[in-house]
Structure formats: structure tokens, C-alpha cells
């Protein structure tokens, strides 16, 4: 019996009956073995067949078969109802050998030449499988020359059986307070050869409750519990299972916050496991009271571990811990079963005792020291010398504790002094200088430093003065001896004030001209206003209409008299507004330089002199009265003018004020 | 982490005014709390002074109101203490302190030794 | 001003004894009070607060208790640590502070 060719040889090659192509004789037999590579199959096919045709193919014959298995037993030239001749059939080894048979009997009725047949390895495709058989693997199936090779799907590996994909399903850990876990793949059968264990763990003081939920279906036995696929439940005090079979397990209620579950299965079965719903529970927190005038968010019908609730207090009240201010407020409940922090209080908001005011007085509207939420306080300045600043003076206790103005300030309001108030009545008329009675010119200011010098009271802080009269002691503002509230300049009893800081104008040059000369002197207090302290005006825009050429100034102060000394007593003169052109014209001839009086200076006395100011005049406030107003306003300050004060055909100089608002308020604004 | 910082003089004159700076990190003086002053006097008497709270509001002690400010600077997350007029009374170790009644935890500066003396 | 009086000036204890803090307001403080450490060199520490609420940190051997106008702290299982001075404070009108009890090994 020829044996085929056997691999690692070429396996292909030609079979044929003995004689082909001529007849075959009687009572032959032969065999052909032949094997290919493991994980090749053979392939054959006949290219001529013509043996004699008997019942059931018993005379002549040539049989194909593979291991135990006969593939086929052929005969015949044409296939008929129970012969079978191979025609254009393909035949194929089962595994990796063919065994091939021909046989003839002793007689031939005539004579057949038998058959001839090709024969080749090729790969066997061990991933494509007959319908209703098992797949070779559980996932992905690879084939290549020769074999095949099985793969699985994420989150699964290949057992080591090579076909089975077992499910990766240890080591998951649910912490949240309720969740779901169920077998792999659920609804879908659960993967074979697997073991998975899941755990639940929550915090300390949490206890797990199981609930089976949809459907339950692992491979069980009728008589012996769960042999095959489990599912055991496992707590710090008890085990629960193991469970198998179609019936959905009861409620777990576990009493711990720890649950370990694994469910194990075998090799065979087509089932669709399990789902599990979890949810906890906790020792519930006492239900929380809000305090009055508040409540409490979110509510729940019951409140448990880590479960918390805030307070909101109504509008005009506020979270406070005993003194102890809140802007939020937020309680845990902890495992005890205790809150971890008590319950704040939801008090009135109170703004407390209005701050006094300077120079004014404030009235409880709502009831006497009522300063709780939406109380009313009244505030006012005192009378005559005082007035209110753009304010009402009204202040409500708003919800965020702070006096508010209906204007929306928290600020005080301010008590500004009313300015330009004097005792004096004018006459119109020129006079000569006269003393100066209580009240006449009650912004008028003694400046001693080095020399005697005036200046005017702005505001209750600040000073108007000249340049020149205090420029030694810009850098030195505490040397200035500021005097105010008396008429007699050596008198003891007045109101002291002390500079701060000296502002001079940055366009003055000293010992050059007198363009500019206007200083401020801001002081370190406030001072109280009264009929004797009170500040002059600063000019209004429309204040020109009152200072036109010969309308009347008043200068005022303690400088030189008529008798070559300073003035005892306060001293005043009314004096007209000169042109000035006229002015100009009159300080141009020497020993006057050129340019002397610019348009930063107003001239004011009598061409026929003697009503004048002089020296110690210095800083002080050339005034008039702005008769829409009915108050006094600056219009010059005491500057220069010839050296023999009130000399006729010469006028005092002032340093033009209105031309100096801005840098007045600029600065009393920025200091 | 919280923290608080105090900072000023150690050493000021009677009649002058003592001033300190808390300086905040960790956590915003605005968000919530009251932010407080209190000094340990020698003997080691603990005194409240007083406090300024999230909204700027401001508590002081009754005995000490009439020479006493407490104010804050939100860019800066600071607040401090002005205390007008001392006297040799008023030396202590001056802390600052986050105290919030439980809701939340109590934070103290290190303290800042002040001695008042001419 | 509602006073805090910490009567006990001193305390002797020893090691693993248990000791009680007291402290009496002049007045009626609801709850609101809190226990305070401090260490020598050191900023106060607190322990306790609302009476009876431990801060988070605190050892379980503090204990506060009390409400009104009495008020107690206990440490139990004393340790060498616990060596300090401890104060109480009032937060429910303004805030006072008691004058202090200085805990010392007997």
C-alpha cells in the first residue's frame, strides 16, 4: 500500500487507479495515506472516474476517509439514488490526513479505466464553524496558515484553555450612597469561566440595602445547591448564599457599610445572570426646626449621614452664633445621628447707635434708640452755621446693617459751615478805615510766623492766604501761629489752629513779581463755627457781576494804620474796584518793572489815596457781597501795591480769586 | 490653609495711637466670619477688642469703644486695628483671630507683642 | 459685660487621671461658649465649641458639657500633652473670656 507524501514534503500531487489510463485489472487494491501539516487540511478532486457502477458501490470502489470517519465511497461514472460517482465534488480531509482506497473485485463486465485525482494541503479556516455548532472561540476568532487564535473583548481575558473569554470583574468598588451592579454582559448571558467579585463600601455609619431587580437566571441543579454558577453575598457579620437558579433573591438589609459579592461561574450554561440595586441608610439626624425668621433648604422627609440642610433668614434679619456674625450656614448630619454644628439664630439686623455727627445731631424717627432693620434716623446740622451737603440727612436701617441714605450712601452725611455770614451791614458809601466790630469779619485769620500776615477761613480746615505771606515756612507748616475768633490781635483769648501742610501756588516765584500769589494752608483740625469763626465764600461763576470797576471790597485787617503801626484792633476799609487798564497804566512807570500787574490781580482804592491796605494786611480777604446770595464772598487777596500804602494815584493790588477756583478745590479735594 | 499674620510697632508712646495689620491668607475676609482682634495682657488675661465682620460691619468692646477702630482693606485681604490714647495698660500681645462659633474652624495669628512706654 | 469665671487658678492632675474645667457666666449664655488650650509661647488652640461640640482634630478625651450659665470641661485619660492653661470664652453677648485654669502635673 503506497504511503503519500507525508509533510514537511510539498504536499500536492496526482493519484491514480494502476494502468490509468488504460483499464484496471481485477482483484486490485491499493492505499494512499496522506498527512499534512498540523493545522492543513487536504483537498481533493477527481479529473477522470469511471469504475464499474454496483449496488451500494460493493464490486468496485474507491473509498475516502479521514481518521475513523469514511467521507465517501464512490463508484460509477454518474451518481444515482444510492451510488455516488464524485463528478466535480471537492472532497476535504477532517483533520490533517486523507486515506484513500480503490479496490476492484475479480470480474469486469466490460472493460473501465478507473479515475485519476489531484490532491493538495490547504489552511483549514478554524474560525468558520457549521451552523448549530459551537464557535471555536467565545469572542474573536483569528485564522492563519496553519492554526488559529482566540482574543477577547475589553474588559475580558483569554483563559487558559485558549478558547474561553473570562470576564476582568474584580476589584470594582462602589462608594456612592446607591447604585447598580450586575453580572456581566446583563441582560446578555454572563461570560463562562469567570470569577467577580464587587465591593460596596461607604462611610462608617452607613448600612447597604440589596434589592434583586428585573430578572435572575444562573445555572442551577435540581439537587444540588448551585454546583455549577454563584452568586454569595458577604458582610463583615454574615454570608448571604449562594444564590443560583430563576428566582429573584429577597432584600438584603445588610447592617453594614461594607458588602463584598461574587458571583463565579463554570464552562458551560447560557444564562443571564443578575442585576442588583443598592441603596443605604443611615441613624436618622433629630428633623431640623428652622429658627424664627428663617428655614431651612432643602427639606427632606428625613435627614441621615452626610445628608445637610442651610438656613436663609428672611430679609432684615441675619445668621448669628450667639455674637458671632454668619453669611452662610450649613449643619452635617453625622453617624451618630447627631448634627455637627448647632442651630444659628435668625436675629433682627441691627445697625447700632448712628455715629454721631460732626457739627450736627441725629434723631431717632422710628422710636427713641430703635435701630433695628427699617429704622429711621434723622440727621441734622446746627442751625445758622451748619448746612447738610447734597444729603437729606434721612438714613434707614437696611438688611446689610449699615445706616443708608435714600440717595444709597453708607456714609455720614456732611455738616458743611454756611459761609459768608456777617454782621456787618453796608453802607455803599466810602469811609475810612474803621475798627471792625464782633461778627464783621468772622473769617478773618492772624498769621504769625516770622511776620504778621492775615488770611481768610474756607471751610472749617482751610486757610486763604497770600503766597508771599507764608512762603518761609512752606516746609514748615507747624511754625505757623494760626490765630481766629478774636478782634484784638494781641488779645489772649481767641481760638488757636495749627497748620498741617501749606499748598503754594506752583506758578508763584518768589521775589519775582507777584503773579500767583495765593496759598492754602489746610489745618490740622477742624474748627467749631460760631458768630465769631465762620468761613468766607469762594466766588460763584456769576460772582463777576459784582466786582465790576467801582463796585465796593472790603479789605480787612491788622496791618499798619495811617500811624506807621499795626493796627490793635481789627480795621476795615471800603474800597471801589479800579479799571484795570488804569491800574496797569499806573504801575508801569518806574520804579515799577514793566508787566507788573497781569490779569491774575484786581486793583481796588480811591485815586486820591488813603484808603488802603498796607502791610500786615498780607494773605487777607478783599470781600464783597453777592447780593442774590446774601453772603460775603472772596473776590482778591491782600497781594502788593506802592510802597507808601494808600498813595495817591496808586491802588492796592489782590491776587484775582475767581481766577483760582480750580486749583482750590482741586486741592481741597485731593487733601 | 488659613493663615493670619500680625504686624505693627512693638513699641509705641503713651497718648500716641497703637496701629496693627492681619494680614489673611488662605481664605477671602469678604466670604464669610468675623475677623478678630483680641490681646493677652501680662498676667495672661485673655481680652477681647473687637471684631469686623464679612460685610465690614464692626463690634467693639464696650470698654474700649471710644478709642477704638477697626477697619479692613478687601484688595488686600488685611484688616486692622487702630487703638487711640494708650497707656502703659494697653501693653500686651495683641492676636488676630478667624472666629466663627463652630461654623467652621478658629484660626489665631501668632501675635504681635506691643509694649507701650515713653 | 457678662463675666467668665474660671474659679480654679490651678489644677494638679497626674497622668491618666480624668479632670474637669469649670467655668460660671454672670449670666444666662445659652450655648455659646468655647474651650481654649494654650501652651506657653503659644496662640490659643481651640477644643471645644457651642459647649459641647468637639472641633475636628480635638482627641475624644475632651469632653464639654453644660449650658446656661455652667460649663464644664473634662479631659479623661489626661496626658503629659494636656499640660496647659485653658480658657473659656462667651460669644453670645459681645465676647469674654475666662481667666484662664492652669493645668499642672501633681
Known amino acids: 500500500t503506497p504511503l503519500g507524501p507525508k509533510w514537511p514534503e510539498p504536499v500536492f500531487g496526482r493519484l491514480a487507479s494502476p494502468g490509468f489510463p488504460g483499464e484496471y485489472a481485477n482483484d486490485q487494491e491499493r492505499r494512499w495515506t496522506l498527512t499534512a501539516p498540523p493545522g492543513y487540511r487536504l483537498r481533493l478532486y477527481f479529473t477522470h472516474f469511471d469504475l464499474e457502477l454496483s449496488h451500494l458501490c460493493e464490486y468496485d470502489f474507491v473509498k475516502l476517509s479521514s481518521g475513523a470517519k469514511v467521507l465517501a465511497t464512490l463508484c460509477g461514472q454518474e451518481s444515482t439514488d444510492t451510488e455516488r460517482a464524485p463528478g466535480k465534488d471537492t472532497f476535504y480531509s477532517l483533520g490533517s490526513s486523507l486515506d484513500i482506497t480503490f479496490r476492484s473485485d475479480y470480474s469486469n463486465e466490460k472493460p473501465f479505466t478507473g479515475f485519476e485525482a489531484f490532491y493538495a494541503a490547504e489552511d483549514i479556516d478554524e474560525c468558520q464553524v457549521a451552523p448549530g455548532e459551537a464557535p471555536t472561540c467565545d469572542h474573536h476568532c483569528h485564522n492563519h496558515l496553519g492554526g488559529f487564535y482566540c482574543s477577547c473583548r475589553a474588559g475580558y481575558v483569554l483563559h487558559r484553555n485558549k478558547r474561553t473569554c473570562s470576564a476582568l470583574c474584580s476589584g470594582q468598588v462602589f462608594t456612592q450612597r446607591s447604585g447598580e451592579l450586575s453580572s456581566p454582559e446583563y441582560p446578555r448571558p454572563y461570560p463562562k469561566l469567570s470569577s467577580c467579585t464587587y465591593s460596596i463600601s461607604l462611610e462608617e455609619g452607613f448600612s447597604v440595602i440589596l434589592d434583586f431587580v428585573e430578572s435572575f437566571d444562573v445555572e442551577t441543579h435540581p439537587e444540588t445547591l448551585c454546583p455549577y454558577d454563584f452568586l454569595k453575598i458577604q458582610t463583615d457579620r454574615e454570608e448571604h448564599g449562594p444564590f443560583c437558579g430563576k428566582t429573584l433573591p429577597h432584600r438584603i438589609e445588610t447592617k453594614s457599610n461594607t458588602v463584598t459579592i461574587t458571583f463565579v461561574t463554570d464552562e458551560s450554561g447560557d444564562h443571564t445572570g443578575w442585576k442588583i440595586h443598592y441603596t443605604s441608610t443611615a441613624q436618622p439626624c433629630p428633623y431640623p426646626m428652622a429658627p424664627p425668621n428663617g428655614h431651612v433648604s432643602p427639606v427632606q422627609a428625613k435627614y441621615i449621614l452626610k445628608d445637610s440642610f442651610s438656613i436663609f433668614c428672611e430679609t432684615g434679619y441675619e445668621l448669628l452664633q450667639g455674637h458671632l456674625p454668619l453669611k452662610s450656614f450649613t449643619a452635617v448630619c453625622q453617624k451618630d445621628g447627631s448634627w455637627d454644628r448647632p442651630m444659628p439664630a435668625c436675629s433682627i439686623v441691627d445697625c447700632g447707635p448712628p455715629d454721631d455727627l460732626p457739627s450736627g445731631r441725629v434723631e431717632y424717627i422710628t422710636g427713641p434708640g430703635v435701630t433695628t432693620y427699617k429704622a429711621v434716623i434723622q440727621y441734622s446740622c446746627e442751625e445758622t452755621f451748619y448746612t447738610m451737603k447734597v444729603n437729606d440727612g434721612k438714613y434707614v436701617c437696611e438688611a446689610d446693617g449699615f445706616w443708608t441714605s435714600s440717595k444709597g450712601e453708607k456714609s455720614l452725611p456732611v455738616c458743611e459751615p454756611v459761609c459768608g455770614l456777617s454782621a456787618r451791614t453796608t453802607g455803599g458809601r466810602i469811609y475810612g478805615g474803621q475798627k471792625a466790630k464782633p461778627g464783621d469779619f468772622p473769617w478773618q485769620v492772624l498769621i504769625l510766623g516770622g511776620t504778621t500776615a492775615a488770611g481768610a477761613l474756607l471751610y472749617d480746615n482751610w486757610v486763604l492766604t497770600a503766597a508771599h505771606a507764608v512762603y518761609e515756612q512752606k516746609h514748615d507748616a507747624s511754625a505757623l501761629d494760626i490765630r481766629m475768633g478774636t478782634l484784638k490781635r494781641l488779645s489772649p483769648h481767641y481760638t488757636q489752629a495749627w497748620s498741617e501742610a501749606v499748598f503754594i501756588h506752583e506758578g508763584y516765584t518768589h521775589d519775582a513779581g507777584f503773579d500767583n500769589d495765593i496759598a492754602l494752608i489746610k489745618l490740622n483740625n477742624k474748627v467749631v463755627i460760631n458768630s465769631n469763626i465762620t468761613p468766607i465764600c469762594l466766588p460763584r461763576k456769576e460772582a463777576e457781576s459784582f466786582m465790576r470797576t467801582d463796585d465796593i471790597g472790603t479789605a480787612s485787617g491788622w496791618g499798619l494804620t495811617q500811624r506807621g503801626f499795626l493796627a490793635r484792633n481789627l480795621m476795615y476799609v471800603d474800597i471801589p474796584i479800579v479799571d484795570h487798564q488804569k491800574c496797569t497804566a499806573a504801575y508801569e512807570k518806574p520804579p515799577y518793572p514793566r508787566g507788573s500787574v497781569t490779569a491774575n490781580m484786581l486793583c481796588a482804592g480811591l485815586e486820591s489815596g488813603g484808603k488802603d491796605s498796607c502791610r500786615g494786611d498780607s494773605g487777607g480777604a478783599l470781600v464783597f457781597l453777592d447780593s442774590e446770595t446774601e453772603r460775603w464772598f472772596v473776590g482778591g487777596i491782600v497781594s502788593w501795591g506802592s510802597m507808601n500804602c494808600g498813595e495817591a494815584g496808586q491802588y492796592g493790588v489782590y491776587t484775582k480769586v475767581i481766577n483760582y477756583i480750580p486749583w482750590i478745590e482741586n486741592i481741597i479735594s485731593d487733601f | 490653609d488659613v493663615q493670619l499674620q500680625e504686624s505693627g510697632p512693638g513699641l509705641v508712646k503713651p497718648s500716641q495711637s497703637l496701629s496693627l495689620t492681619c494680614t489673611v491668607t488662605?481664605?477671602?475676609?469678604?466670604?464669610?466670619?468675623?475677623w478678630n482682634w483680641i490681646r493677652q495682657l501680662p498676667g495672661n488675661k485673655l481680652e477681647w477688642v473687637g471684631y469686623?465682620?464679612?460685610?465690614?460691619?464692626?463690634s467693639y468692646n464696650p470698654s474700649l469703644k471710644s478709642r477704638i477702630s477697626i477697619t479692613r482693606d478687601t484688595t488686600k485681604n488685611q484688616f486692622f486695628l487702630q487703638l487711640n490714647s494708650v497707656t502703659t495698660e494697653d501693653t500686651a500681645t495683641y492676636y488676630c483671630?478667624?472666629?466663627?462659633?463652630?461654623?467652621?474652624?478658629?484660626?489665631w495669628g501668632q501675635g504681635t507683642s506691643v509694649t507701650v512706654s515713653s | 459685660n457678662i463675666v467668665m469665671t474660671q474659679s480654679q487658678k490651678f489644677m494638679s492632675t497626674s497622668v491618666g487621671d480624668r479632670v474637669s474645667v469649670t467655668c460660671k457666666a454672670s449670666?444666662?449664655?445659652?450655648?455659646?461658649v468655647a474651650w481654649y488650650q494654650q501652651k506657653p509661647g503659644q496662640s490659643p488652640k481651640a477644643l471645644i465649641h457651642?459647649?459641647?461640640y468637639r472641633y475636628s482634630g480635638v482627641p475624644d478625651r475632651f469632653t464639654g458639657s453644660g449650658s446656661g450659665t455652667d460649663f464644664i470641661l473634662t479631659i479623661s485619660n489626661v496626658q503629659s500633652e494636656d499640660l496647659a492653661e485653658y480658657f473659656c470664652?462667651?460669644?453670645?453677648?459681645?465676647?469674654?473670656f475666662g481667666s484662664g485654669t492652669k493645668l499642672e502635673l501633681k
Open positions: 483671630a478667624k472666629l466663627a462659633g463652630g461654623h467652621g474652624m478658629d484660626y
Open positions: 488662605g481664605y477671602s475676609i469678604t466670604s464669610d466670619y468675623a
Open positions: 469686623i465682620s464679612y460685610s465690614g460691619r464692626t
Open positions: 449670666q444666662n449664655v445659652d450655648t455659646n
Open positions: 457651642s459647649a459641647s
Open positions: 470664652l462667651q460669644y453670645n453677648s459681645y465676647l469674654t
